[in-house]
C-alpha cells in the first residue's frame, strides 16, 4: 500500500522559508500528480498546489508568489518551499496523492506535520509541547486557590482560539493519576458528584465546585481536544485556607 511521510522542521521563524519533503513508499512516484494541503489548528483545509512527476506545477493563486514545488523521482520524494512566513502559516501540512490527473481527489495522505511559525521557542510548561509549541495556548487561572469547605469556587480556562465545546476537566490528588470530571465543556462524567459543573464554549470555560468538600482539595486541569495535539492547562491547585 502507498504510504506518504512528511518531514521538516516543527518550528520556523517569521520571514524565513519553510522546506518540507514528502517521501513516498509502497509505490512509484511516477505518473501521478502530488499535492500539498494545509490545515491551521481547528480550521478547514487549504490546497497549496500540485506537481506532476515531469516537474510541471500548479499553485493556489493566493500563495503562488511564495510557493515552489519540486520532485525527485530517483528518491521517490517531492518537496514544498514556502517563503516569507508569518504566524498565519502555522498549520498542519499534509502531502497527498491524487487518483488521476483530472479528478483531483486525494486517495492517499501523509499523517501531517505540524509547523509553528513563531519567533519564540515554544512553551515548556503544563500541557505545552516543550520545543515546538502546540498551536492552541491555554491559560488556566488562578494557579492557586485558597478556600474553605462549603465555599463555592470557580476556575477559569481560556483558549487562544475557538475550540467549540471540546473541553474536559480533570481532578488530580497528590500521588494519584488525574480523573475525568467533565467532558464536552459541561457534561458530568458518570459517578462525579453534582456539585461539580462546567460551562462555556468557544474560548472561555469555567469549572465550578458549588460546595467544596474536604475531598475536593486537589489540582484541577482543563484539556482541549478540538485540535491535534491534545493539550492541557497548567493546573489550578485548590488548597485549604488556613
Amino acid at each position: 500500500q502507498v504510504q506518504l511521510q512528511e518531514s521538516g522542521p516543527g518550528l520556523v521563524k517569521p520571514s524565513e522559508t519553510l522546506s518540507l519533503t514528502c517521501t513516498v513508499s509502497g509505490g512509484s512516484i511516477s505518473n501521478y500528480y502530488w499535492s500539498w494541503i494545509r490545515q491551521p489548528a481547528g480550521k478547514g483545509l487549504e490546497w497549496i498546489g500540485r506537481i506532476y512527476t515531469s516537474g510541471s506545477t500548479n499553485y493556489n493563486p493566493s500563495l503562488k508568489s511564495r510557493v515552489t514545488m519540486s520532485v525527485d523521482t530517483s528518491k521517490n520524494q517531492f518537496s514544498l518551499k514556502l517563503s516569507s512566513l508569518t504566524a498565519a502559516d502555522t498549520a498542519i501540512y499534509y502531502c497527498a496523492r491524487y487518483y488521476d490527473i483530472l479528478t483531483g481527489f486525494f486517495d492517499y495522505w501523509g499523517q501531517g506535520t505540524l509547523v509553528t511559525v513563531s519567533s519564540g521557542g515554544g512553551g515548556s510548561g503544563g500541557g505545552g509541547s516543550g520545543g515546538g509549541g502546540s498551536v492552541i495556548w491555554m491559560t488556566q487561572s488562578p494557579s492557586l486557590l485558597s478556600a474553605s469547605t462549603g465555599d463555592s469556587v470557580t476556575i477559569s480556562c481560556r483558549m487562544s482560539q475557538d475550540i467549540s465545546s471540546y473541553l474536559a476537566w480533570y481532578q488530580q490528588k497528590p500521588g494519584k493519576a488525574p480523573e475525568l470530571l467533565i467532558y464536552a465543556a459541561s457534561s458530568l462524567q458518570s459517578g462525579v458528584p453534582s456539585r461539580f459543573s462546567g460551562s462555556g464554549s468557544g474560548t472561555d470555560f469555567t469549572l465550578t465546585i458549588s460546595s467544596l468538600q474536604s475531598e475536593d482539595f486537589a489540582t484541577y486541569y482543563c484539556q482541549q481536544y478540538d485540535s491535534f495535539p491534545p493539550t492541557f492547562g497548567q493546573g489550578t491547585k485548590v488548597e485549604f485556607k488556613r
Partner: antibody, heavy 119, light 112 residues
C-alpha cells in the same frame, strides 16, 4: 470494570531507551473508536500528551517528540507499549497510560509509573 | 475561487441514526467534460483526512455502503444511513472542477 496499569524500568541513564508497557482490562482495543495512549507529568508540573494508538492501528505522536516515540499494541494480550529513544533528564516524570473513547477525552487513567533519568 | 459552504457546522447524532450533511458551491461544479468533481472526506481527531466519496456519488474502496453521496450543479449531500462510533469526526466536501481546488469548512459529527 476498566483498569489500566503501567510498568517500566524506574531508572535509566541518559541516552538509553525507555520501554513502557500498559496492561489493561475491562475493554478491548478491537472496539471501534477505542484508543489507548500515554501522558506524562514531571514532578510538580503539568501534563503532556505523548502518543496514542487506535483500534485500527492508527498511531499519533506529539509533533515535537515524534522522532523519539514509537507506540504499538498487542490486542490479544490487552497491552500497549511505548518506546522513547535517547532519554535525558528532562524525561524524568510519571508516565500514565490512558484510555480514549467516544468523546475523545481521557476517561480512564492508570496509577502511573515513575521514571528517573540520572547518570 | 469557488466557495464551498457546508451545513450544519456541528451535527449531534445518536448511534444508529441517519445523518445528512449539505455542501453548496458558489458556482456549478459541472466540468466542461460533463463530470462533476465533488468529493467527500472524513477527518478523525489527530488524523489526516480519508477519502470517502469521489465525483459526487462514488464510494472509495473500503468505504462502507452506509455512506452515500448525491447532488448536482451546486447542491450536494452526504448521507450516512446508520451512524456508527467509527464515523465520528469532521466531514469535508471538496471541489476540483475549478482551480484552485477548495474545501468546505467542515461538519463535525458528534454523539448527542
Amino acid at each position: 470494570q476498566v483498569t489500566l496499569k503501567e510498568s517500566g524500568p524506574g531508572i535509566l541513564k541518559p541516552s538509553q531507551t525507555l520501554s513502557l508497557t500498559c496492561s489493561f482490562s475491562g475493554f478491548s482495543l478491537n472496539t471501534f473508536g477505542m484508543g489507548v495512549g500515554w501522558i506524562r507529568q514531571p514532578s510538580g508540573k503539568g501534563l503532556e500528551w505523548l502518543a496514542h494508538i487506535w483500534w485500527d492501528d492508527d498511531k499519533h505522536y506529539h509533533p515535537s517528540l515524534k522522532s523519539q516515540l514509537t507506540i504499538s499494541k498487542d490486542t490479544s494480550r490487552n497491552q500497549v507499549f511505548l518506546k522513547i529513544t535517547s532519554v535525558d533528564t528532562t524525561d524524568t516524570a510519571t508516565y500514565y497510560c490512558v484510555r480514549r473513547y467516544r468523546y475523545d477525552v481521557f476517561d480512564y487513567w492508570g496509577p502511573g509509573t515513575t521514571l528517573t533519568v540520572s547518570s | 475561487d469557488v466557495m464551498m459552504t457546508q451545513t450544519p457546522l456541528s451535527l449531534p447524532v445518536s448511534l444508529g441514526d441517519q445523518a445528512s450533511i449539505s455542501c453548496r458551491s458558489s458556482q456549478s461544479l459541472v466540468h466542461s467534460n460533463g463530470n462533476t468533481y465533488l468529493h467527500w472526506y472524513l477527518q478523525k481527531p489527530g488524523q489526516s483526512p480519508k477519502l470517502l466519496i469521489y465525483k459526487v456519488s462514488n464510494r472509495f474502496s473500503g468505504v462502507p455502503d452506509r455512506f452515500s453521496g448525491s447532488g448536482s450543479g451546486t447542491d450536494f449531500t452526504l448521507k450516512i444511513s446508520r451512524v456508527e462510533a467509527e464515523d465520528l469526526g469532521v466531514y469535508f466536501c471538496s471541489q476540483s472542477t475549478h482551480g484552485p481546488w477548495t474545501f468546505g469548512g467542515g461538519t463535525k459529527l458528534e454523539i448527542k
